[in-house]
């Protein structure tokens, strides 16, 4: 049953907690020789090729939480949260990137058209209007003489944790991969822990892969605390269901306040932010598996 958390029955392609709609890969590949192929080029953005009767289909199986943490997509649409954006990219097999946190409408408020050209997505977000979409955490510097995307990623505080990336280069920390991705404005993924070696297949490394199922899991720094339940922390009461979006809710008895113990890869007061600072991966054959 497609029941969103917190009640209110749902159904359909964007149903919270349900499976995303499947895309028939034969419709995406209009090649006479191999019409039914379902591969990395036809089933991207987190899609998984699955058998469907005679052929294969590209399934988008995203379990998205329903909290309203809106993001503005590069296509001009606002998404309920980042997971909804990723699911849409998979569903439509189009690249959609987050160009701004918050809705896409311009800053002149709600009501009667929201001050944007209806349906065009022309003025997606004022902050990015001159640069075009700045991807991979880059920001638009409109004051600069040569208007462009600038990267303000500071990797100075990260410890030595070398990784091999999809561009064939070794980086001293996953943060530097993000920085390179931001500067080059292209997708660079982490392939494995440790420096790249001669045995690494550079043709494979060079391939861009948006498949979330291969993406390494990440850990929130707060997960390194060795907190033990010593009578001070207890599970939160039922009325705080949903307080922690990606984590466990703990009720601190002494302060009578709730706090969140975030799952791997999330940070923020409600575990609502994605954090890519610390990486833990376990290589399994050629693919990376989540810890």
């Amino acid at each position: 049953s497609n029941q969103p958390p917190g009640g209110g029955g749902g159904s359909g392609g964007d149903c919270p907690g349900g499976k995303g709609k499947s895309i028939n890969c034969s419709e995406l590949n209009v090649r006479e020789s191999d019409v039914r192929v379902c591969d990395e080029s036809s089933c991207k953005y987190g899609g998984v090729c699955k058998e469907d009767g005679d052929g294969l289909k590209c399934a988008c199986q995203f379990q998205c939480h329903t909290n309203y943490i809106p993001v503005c997509g590069s296509n001009g649409d606002t998404y309920q949260n980042e997971c909804f954006l990723r699911r849409a990219a998979c569903k439509h097999q189009k690249e959609i990137t987050v160009i701004a946190r918050g809705p896409c409408y311009s800053d002149n408020g709600s009501g009667s058209g929201e001050g944007e050209e209806e349906g065009s997505g022309a003025e997606v977000h004022r902050k990015h209007s001159k640069c075009g979409p700045c991807k991979y955490k880059a920001e638009c510097d409109e004051d600069a003489e040569n208007v462009g995307c600038v990267c303000n990623i500071d990797c100075s505080g990260y410890s030595f944790n070398p990784v091999c990336a999809s561009d064939g280069s070794s980086y001293n920390n996953p943060c530097f991969v993000r920085e390179a991705s931001c500067i080059k404005q292209e997708q660079i993924d982490i392939r494995h822990l440790g420096h790249c070696t001669d045995t690494d297949d550079t043709s494979l490394l060079g391939k861009k892969d948006d498949g979330l199922q291969y993406r390494p899991d990440v850990k929130d720094a707060s997960d390194q605390r060795e907190d033990v339940y010593i009578g001070n922390h207890m599970p939160c009461p039922e009325n705080l269901n949903g307080y922690c979006i990606h984590g466990k809710c703990e009720f601190i008895y002494s302060t009578q306040k709730a706090s969140c113990r975030c799952e791997s890869g999330y940070t923020g007061q409600h575990c609502e932010k994605t954090d890519f600072s610390i990486l833990y991966v376990v290589p399994s054959r050629q693919k990376l598996t989540h810890v």
Partner: antibody
Framework: EVQLLESGGGLVQPGGSLRLSCAAS????????MSWVRQAPGKGLEWVST????????YYADSVKGRFTISRDNSKNTLYLQMNSLRVEDTAIYYC????????????????WGQGTLVTVSS | EIVMTQSPATLSVSPGERATLSCRAS??????LAWYQQKPGQVPRLLIY???TRATGIPARFSGSGSGTEFTLTISSLQSEDFAVYYC?????????FGGGTKVEIK
């Protein structure tokens, strides 16, 4: 100017059916999720149902689940609410409302609201 | 579901005075809260969204504040046209829920 105009309300017996319509104009209808919100006489507001802009996702309040069906025809810029197995407690003014933000949004504020159509369920 | 509780149920204020309306959520809704005004025989009208952002055309005397579970709508100097019922609504998660309303009446 965004306009929403409801129709289809009226008097119906318990167990009966009604179909409400909401004609929309002044905005790109298919880009916005649309909702029905009701208000019983002298009471507060209650969210009833929401449908995504494309129409492929629908959401219902527990009180109407299994009895009401929300749908839309984007070619006609029209939102519908099919109400079956009506109960006395369904008596209310039914408002059609647009979400404030366009896109793949499933929760939002309502802006603007239609004038409403009165549904009376009585024997 | 998230229960929204408004207080007081009725607020008696003289024109020109300040009115403070409260809305409490049973669990955190971040800043995902809206306020509506409904005058007798009229449809609800959006005043505030995002807990503190005024909607288009709403006078500056209306202001919203708060986040998490405690929210406030303040009308700095009540005008005759402000006497109405005010509702809060959370849109943080399903199902969308409204408060019971606060009626602002002439003292």
């Amino acid at each position: 100017e965004v306009q929403l105009l409801e129709s289809g309300g009226g008097l119906v017996q318990p167990g009966g059916s009604l179909r409400l319509s909401c004609a929309a104009s002044g905005f790109t209808f298919s880009s916005y999720a649309m909702s029905w919100v009701r208000q019983a006489p002298g009471k507060g507001l209650e969210w009833v149902s929401t449908i995504s802009g494309s129409g492929d996702s629908t959401y219902y309040a527990d009180s109407v689940k299994g009895r009401f069906t929300i749908s839309r025809d984007n070619s006609k810029n029209t939102l519908y609410l099919q109400m079956n197995s009506l109960r006395v407690e369904d008596t209310a003014i039914y408002y059609c409302a647009k979400f404030g933000v366009r896109g793949v949004i499933i929760t939002n504020w309502f802006d603007p609201w239609g004038q409403g159509t009165l549904v009376t369920v009585s024997s | 579901e998230i229960v929204m509780t408004q207080s007081p149920a009725t607020l008696s204020v003289s024109p020109g005075e300040r009115a403070t309306l409260s809305c409490r959520a049973s669990q955190s809704v971040s800043s995902n809260l809206a306020w509506y005004q409904q005058k007798p025989g009229q449809v609800p009208r959006l005043l505030i969204y995002g807990a503190s952002t005024r909607a288009t055309g709403i006078p500056a005397r209306f202001s919203g504040s708060g986040s998490g579970t405690e929210f406030t709508l303040t009308i700095s100097s009540l005008q005759s046209e402000d006497f109405a019922v005010y509702y809060c609504q959370q849109y943080n998660n399903w199902p969308l829920t409204f408060g019971g309303g606060t009626k602002v009446e002439i003292k």
